[in-house]
């Protein structure tokens, strides 16, 4: 479960701007562009607009290279330098035969078997909830449970830093194995059980993780877009947990969108489960004071608490997770390979 | 690679069967919703059938409700469309498709219900 | 049912002009589940646009989609020749998921 390097990804925007730089007209180009990207936060300082004459030459210099269709990893190291090139380079698709809702992450997915000791879990009672068993199978995997205390300690206290917490957030999510991360966070209850509700709406400290007053969703939607890191989850989430139907079809696959899900757990638009006794998610915002803007606010809050795709992509993982410990294990370590394509 | 292929598609007498298959291959089947729409000769797409990625919801079209079956086994990355009692307004192209972001089409299959 | 109801039936237009079509459903549609199709002759149907306003994967940027409610537009900003065709709108909304009868976009 390393972390992926630049060379296992098909094309990364490092490598592609590296590329790039080898080439003096393509190097200039960029540099150009670089110019041209308005920071969400502040004007251009050179007053120069994106799509003034200079910057749509230099953007049509781009399109034959390889920077124009380049991608980032979730999980991979300089993360940010890449996401910062895709940005860059972003704009370049509004100006061409490019979709404008695709998601900066490439998805390299990898099927592996999940491999669990489950012999310790005997030290629980037989009956204890399965949050309990997930929590403990992380507590139980050396690399898990380091990540976990990191972002336990970084959330805890009255007077908790807030943004610390969630880079650690942040951090366990990208580096913890998936089937672990998954297992402690999509965890099922017995809807009679809320303190195994409980346990699951904090896995991501809540008091710490999510802003103390509520703030209006199109402010936090606006304060995410205005960070790459943030704007980049954003938009994996929009492009996989689009429902296609009312059946919860996932506009690309459900692995994906819980990926996508998983992803924005740490930044400004972290969401939660909402309640102990259901699995209803949502974001920490209101739409109060949405003025005329309030249907679009509805809008983006429903993106996550009335979702189908999402709802159902949860919903079947709990059911696998379920599965899980449904049956008799003749071994106590066992070995799954996630029907659902690694998800 | 990615792709959808129709069979068992051909002549059949009013009130008679069918049973369309549409293979998948190049992507996790079990993982998408499919759909089956058909096309009667020189008129527009109308849509007959779906299910869902576990196969436990299935809805169909007016036309076909009572009638038509849609199935899948997700061993064999196969989507079925049964047709009974069928009548001469079924003559169509049927394709199967899974219709997401990046969607897939079979090439079709023609169904022609005639005396 | 959701009947939905294109106009115009066909559309007559040249190389790099406008064109727009119009899809009007029977009853409120959520915009999430209303996607927009071409096919050419011969060919299956190819999704454009999803979720009302998305381009679906590897479709040209010249294609544009709007609307919400009842009222639903496909947009091409300036004609192709390849995109001389038929198209479709969809709703997925509430069952059966239904299509419009279609718009011929032909060359004049």
């Known amino acids: 479960n390393s972390l992926p390097t630049e060379n296992r990804l098909v094309n990364s925007c490092t490598q592609a701007r590296k590329k790039c730089e080898a080439n003096p007209a393509c190097k200039a180009a960029y540099q150009h562009l670089d110019s041209c990207t308005p920071s969400l936060s502040s004007p251009l300082p050179s007053g120069e607009s994106a799509t003034s004459a200079a910057c749509l030459e230099a953007a049509q210099q781009l399109r034959n290279s390889s920077l124009i269709d380049c991608r980032c990893h979730r999980r991979m190291k300089h993360q940010a330098t890449c996401l910062d090139i895709y940005w860059t380079v972003h704009p370049v698709r509004s100006l061409g035969d490019y979709e404008l809702d695709v998601s900066p992450y490439e998805d390299t997915v990898t099927s592996k078997p999940w491999k669990m000791n489950l012999s310790k879990l005997s030290m629980l009672k037989p009956d204890s909830d399965l949050c309990l068993k997930f929590a403990m199978l992380c507590t139980l995997n050396d690399k898990c449970d380091r990540l976990r205390k990191a972002y336990g300690e970084a959330c805890s206290g009255i007077r908790c830093q807030r943004h610390l917490c969630l880079a650690q957030l942040r951090s366990f999510f990208e580096k913890a194995a998936e089937s672990h991360a998954q297992g402690l966070l999509l965890c099922p209850c017995a809807p009679e059980d809320a303190g195994c509700g409980e346990r699951r709406r904090n896995t991501i400290a809540p008091s710490c993780a999510l802003p103390s007053v509520a703030p209006n969703c199109l402010d936090l939607r606006s304060f995410c877009r205005a960070d790459p890191l943030c704007r980049s989850r954003l938009m994996d989430f929009q492009t996989h947990c689009h429902p296609m139907d009312i059946l919860g079809t996932c506009a690309t696959e459900q692995s994906r969108c819980l990926r996508a899900y998983l992803g924005l757990i740490g930044t400004a638009m972290t969401p939660n489960f909402i309640s102990k006794v259901n699995t209803t998610v949502a974001l920490g915002c209101t739409c109060r004071g949405s003025g005329n803007l309030q249907d679009e606010c509805e809008q983006l809050e429903k993106s996550f608490s009335q979702n189908p795709c999402l709802m159902e992509a949860i919903a079947a993982k709990m059911r696998f997770h379920r599965q899980l410990f449904s049956q008799d294990w003749a071994d106590s370590t066992f070995s799954v390979m996630q029907q659902q394509n690694s998800s | 690679q990615v792709q959808l292929v129709e069979s068992g598609g051909g002549l059949v007498q009013p009130g008679g069967s069918l049973r369309l298959s549409c293979a998948a291959s190049?992507?996790?089947?079990?993982?998408?919703?499919m759909h089956w729409v058909r096309q009667a000769p020189g008129k527009g797409l109308e849509w007959v059938s779906v299910?869902?990625?576990?196969?436990?919801?299935?809805y169909y079209a007016d036309s076909v409700k009572g009638r038509f079956t849609i199935s899948r086994d997700n061993s064999k990355n196969t989507l079925y469309l049964q047709m009974n009692s069928l009548r001469a307004e079924d003559t169509a192209v049927y394709y199967c498709?899974?219709?997401?972001?990046?969607?897939?089409w079979g090439q079709g299959t023609l169904v022609t219900v005639s005396s | 049912d959701i009947v939905l109801t294109q106009s115009p039936a066909t559309l007559s237009l040249s190389p790099g002009e406008r064109a727009t079509l119009s899809c009007r459903a029977s009853?409120?549609?959520?915009?999430?589940?209303l996607a927009w199709y071409q096919q050419k002759p011969g060919q299956a149907p190819r999704l454009l646009i999803y979720?009302?306003?998305n381009r679906a994967t590897g479709v040209p940027a010249r294609f544009s989609g709007s609307g919400s409610g009842t009222d639903f537009t496909l947009t091409i900003s300036s004609l192709e020749p390849e995109d001389f065709a038929t198209y479709y709108c969809?709703?997925?909304?509430?069952?059966?998921?239904?299509f419009g009868q279609g718009t011929k976009v032909e060359i004049k």
């Open positions: 498709a899974r219709i997401v972001r990046m969607d897939i």
């Open positions: 979720g009302a306003s």
């Open positions: 190049g992507f996790t089947f079990s993982n998408y919703t």
């Open positions: 009853q409120s549609v959520n915009s999430h589940y």
């Open positions: 299910i869902s990625y576990d196969g436990s919801s299935t």
């Open positions: 969809q709703q997925m909304d509430g069952f059966p998921f239904t």
